[in-house]
């Protein structure tokens, strides 16, 4: 079925988009599949639906489960499924595989690392970037919009990169982190 995996960390913001896209004018209803209970749209709730988006502000481990979105046009109803898993923060610095987004490759000429899922959030620059839990410092690293650009890429630049940013919702701030591996390939 039309399903998408999403994951996040407890006490962080998580925003999930309905995998079944529709035109902006279409209405979207969200349900928690296990109970068939409707997700509220009122923003005072910790978990609420906002059109195509389902927002966990912040997320809790108990939020894990399958969420159903039904996109309604005047004549068609189409269903999507968001499989959401919320994890406890890992105690050590190493990010487990299940929290990793897709690996990206870079070379000397092209070394952009995109911060995963950031387009779903209301954030303002600059992004914070970490490699293997260490904050990136030095002129070789440039945070540009939703990307990290590394100048003069070397083999040693390979590793796990984490972006951290703040999502703002009605004046309240929530932290979001996302990690992906970066590999260096020869030209």
């Amino acid at each position: 079925k039309f399903s998408k995996q999403s994951w996040g960390l407890e006490n962080e913001a998580l925003i999930v988009r309905c995998p079944r896209q529709g035109k902006p004018s279409y209405t979207v209803d969200w349900y928690y599949s296990q109970t068939n209970k409707s997700i509220p749209t009122q923003e005072r709730n910790r978990v609420f639906a906002s059109g195509q988006l389902l927002k966990f502000l912040p997320a809790a481990v108990a939020d894990s489960g399958i969420y159903t979105c039904i996109v309604r046009s005047p004549t068609f109803n189409r269903t999507g499924y968001a499989n959401v898993t919320i994890y406890k923060k890992p105690p050590s610095c190493n990010v487990p595989d299940y929290l990793m987004y897709s690996t990206v490759s870079g070379s000397e000429k092209n070394s952009k690392i995109y911060c995963p899922t950031i387009d779903l959030y209301n954030w303002t620059a600059p992004l914070e970037w970490f490699k293997n839990c260490q904050a990136l410092q030095g002129s070789r690293y440039r945070a540009h919009k939703s990307f990290l650009v590394i100048d003069n890429v070397m083999t040693e630049d390979a590793g796990d990169y984490t972006c951290k940013f703040i999502h703002n919702e009605n004046g309240a701030n929530y932290s979001v982190t996302a990690t992906r591996s970066f590999t260096v390939k020869d030209e």
Epitope: K1, S73, T75, F76, R78
Partner: antibody, heavy 123, light 107 residues
Framework: EVQLLESGGGLVQPGGSLRLSCAAS????????MIWVRQAPGKGLEWVSS????????YYADSVKGRFTISRDNSKNTLYLQMNSLRAEDTAVYYC????????????????WGQGTLVTVSS | EIVLTQSPATLSLSPGERATLSCRAS??????LAWYQQKPGQAPRLLIY???NRATGIPARFSGSGSGTDFTLTISSLEPEDFAVYYC?????????FGQGTKVEIK
């Protein structure tokens, strides 16, 4: 009421050209993707070409790529199919149809169809 | 391109009988599959979308099922007006493709 009305079909010699039109009414034409589908006599349905709504991106079947051009005039609520270098195998009833849903990068079903216009390519 | 194979090519049944039509995709189309009905001299009419949802105005005797590569259109009790050709169509990716059709004829 949604209506699609094709015109422009007829008899044409191999190598010739023809321009089909599809006049749409009863809906906001500009926001919908539109499609041409054809059906050779006694045969099944074959997708020919699609055009996005306001964005205007186009897609073609391999069998017509480079010979046919789909276009639209949203101010006139009209869809077109310019057919050049016609071959005998292009002989078919040509239907225009509406995709009521699709978003950029996706497609959906065809919920309204015209009555079709017959194109015959023969010498 | 994704090839859709319909079976049988022809189904000979009497009014009131149950019709079961099959559509098999050469690769997974998730549930992005539709069924159409076409009568002689007419344009196709949408019956089912997203594998199992009836389009507006389609009688409840028409139902669709399946996901991935194997799909079924069932007409629970054939009415005289149901004798026609039925096509499946996938829309998960371009080029959009149709099956070759199943003709449901009066026995």
């Amino acid at each position: 009421e949604v209506q699609l009305l094709e015109s422009g079909g007829g008899l044409v010699q191999p190598g010739g050209s023809l321009r089909l039109s599809c006049a749409a009414s009863g809906f906001t034409f500009s926001i919908y993707d539109m499609i041409w589908v054809r059906q050779a006599p006694g045969k099944g349905l074959e997708w020919v070409s699609s055009i996005r709504g306001e964005g205007g991106g186009t897609y073609y079947a391999d069998s017509v790529k480079g010979r046919f051009t789909i276009s639209r005039d949203n101010s006139k609520n009209t869809l077109y199919l310019q057919m050049n270098s016609l071959r005998a195998e292009d002989t078919a009833v040509y239907y225009c149809a509406r995709d009521p849903w699709s978003t950029e990068g996706s497609f959906f079903v065809l919920d309204y169809w015209g009555q079709g216009t017959l194109v015959t390519v023969s010498s | 391109e994704i090839v859709l194979t319909q079976s049988p090519a022809t189904l000979s049944l009497s009014p009131g009988e149950r019709a079961t039509l099959s559509c098999r995709a050469s690769q997974s189309v998730d549930d992005d599959l539709a069924w159409y009905q076409q009568k002689p001299g007419q344009a196709p009419r949408l019956l089912i979308y997203d594998a199992s949802n009836r389009a507006t105005g389609i009688p409840a005797r028409f139902s669709g099922s399946g996901s991935g590569t194997d799909f079924t259109l069932t007409i629970s009790s054939l009415e005289p007006e149901d004798f026609a050709v039925y096509y499946c169509q996938q829309y998960i990716t371009a080029p959009l493709t149709f099956g070759q059709g199943t003709k449901v004829e009066i026995k």
